[in-house]
């Protein structure tokens, strides 16, 4: 089971209208450039077999991947939103740095790996798709971690 006290984010992190709006604006702008609407990264398959108490740990993995492999490499695009949203998400990632789970997390890593593989397979359009789903990442992270 997760060390649940560490796999938590304060509700106040998601009660900042300005940065919430900027995150959603960034997602909307990127989704307009996403021509692959058949694939969804953050959806049922990602959470398959993951219990309620493990959801935040899973979302931490997705957040870290999105930051390191998508947002940082694409940081010059979708301005001015990107320069505001990336530090915000990085702060959330930092606050979840002590979120771990005791025992086997293979099922979670398997699900996250599928998301990573999908993004990598799609190349740059996969990265754009991930940015276009930042609204879902934001909401899923909130719902899983508060």
């Amino acid at each position: 089971a997760p060390i649940s006290s560490h796999c938590r984010l304060d509700k106040s992190n998601f009660q900042q209208p300005y940065i919430t709006n900027r995150t959603f604006m960034l997602a909307k702008e990127a989704s307009l450039a996403d021509n692959n609407t058949d694939v969804r990264l953050i959806g049922e398959k990602l959470f398959h077999g993951v219990s309620m108490s493990e959801r935040c740990y899973l979302m931490k993995q997705v957040l870290n991947f999105t930051l390191e492999e998508v947002l940082f490499p694409q940081s010059d695009r979708f301005q001015p939103y990107m320069q505001e949203v990336v530090p915000f998400l990085a702060r959330l990632s930092n606050r979840l740095s002590t979120c771990h789970i005791e025992g086997d997390d293979l099922h979670i890593q398997r699900n996250v790996q599928k998301l990573k593989d999908t993004v990598k397979k799609l190349g740059e359009s996969g990265e754009i798709k991930a940015i276009g789903e930042l609204d879902l990442l934001f909401m899923s992270l909130r719902n899983a971690c508060i």
Epitope: F14, E44, V50, S51, M52, M139, A144, I146
Partner: antibody, heavy 119, light 112 residues
Amino acid sequence: EVQLVESGGGLVQPGGSLRLSCAVSGFSLSSYAMIWVRQAPGKGLEWIGIIDIDGSTYYASWAKGRFTISRDSSKNTVYLQMNSLRAEDTAVYYCARDRFVGVDIFDPWGQGTLVTVSS
Amino acid sequence: AVVLTQSPSSLSASVGDRVTITCQASEDIYTNLAWYQQKPGKAPKLLIYWASTLASGVPSRFSGSGSGTDFTLTISSLQPEDFATYYCQACVYGNSADSRYTFGGGTKVEIK
């Protein structure tokens, strides 16, 4: 094909007990949480409780103490044990699969089983 | 616990009409809202989640919008099979799990 079939409803006297079953097929209970919802005659939907993938259970505040959700994964069945039944518990009881997509959504639902509490 | 208030509680409409149902939450629920359709004697069926995402197999004449506290379900051109009762449902996280899932009171769409 995903299917949920409730059974165990019927007429029960006030103060009595009843155990409802929800047999599922087409998916595993080790991969999805399951919820119970009820609907009194001519009324709206009311959440009762949920059993998570790991067996943890959570209940609506009004249901705590009288209602218990359990499961038998080998039989692919979820149960709702109802004790100290009252007339106001008369309702159609539904089970539904909880699909978490970043938010919980309930899909699909069973056909429901009617519980009537009357003397 | 969050309270969902649907309006109207019932409405009469004709085939081809545009129908709008609203759901108001007593607190901010972001986009954590779903809509279900229930026909008499049948189980509810998922229509929309994330406030605006159409569930698989649901006709495109159904659409949802809103965030925060105010949400809308729209049927662009009412069909005979759409006469039913519609429920909104919210998920509220971060509070006690005993009030996580809440349904609105329902809106019955009847034939005029």
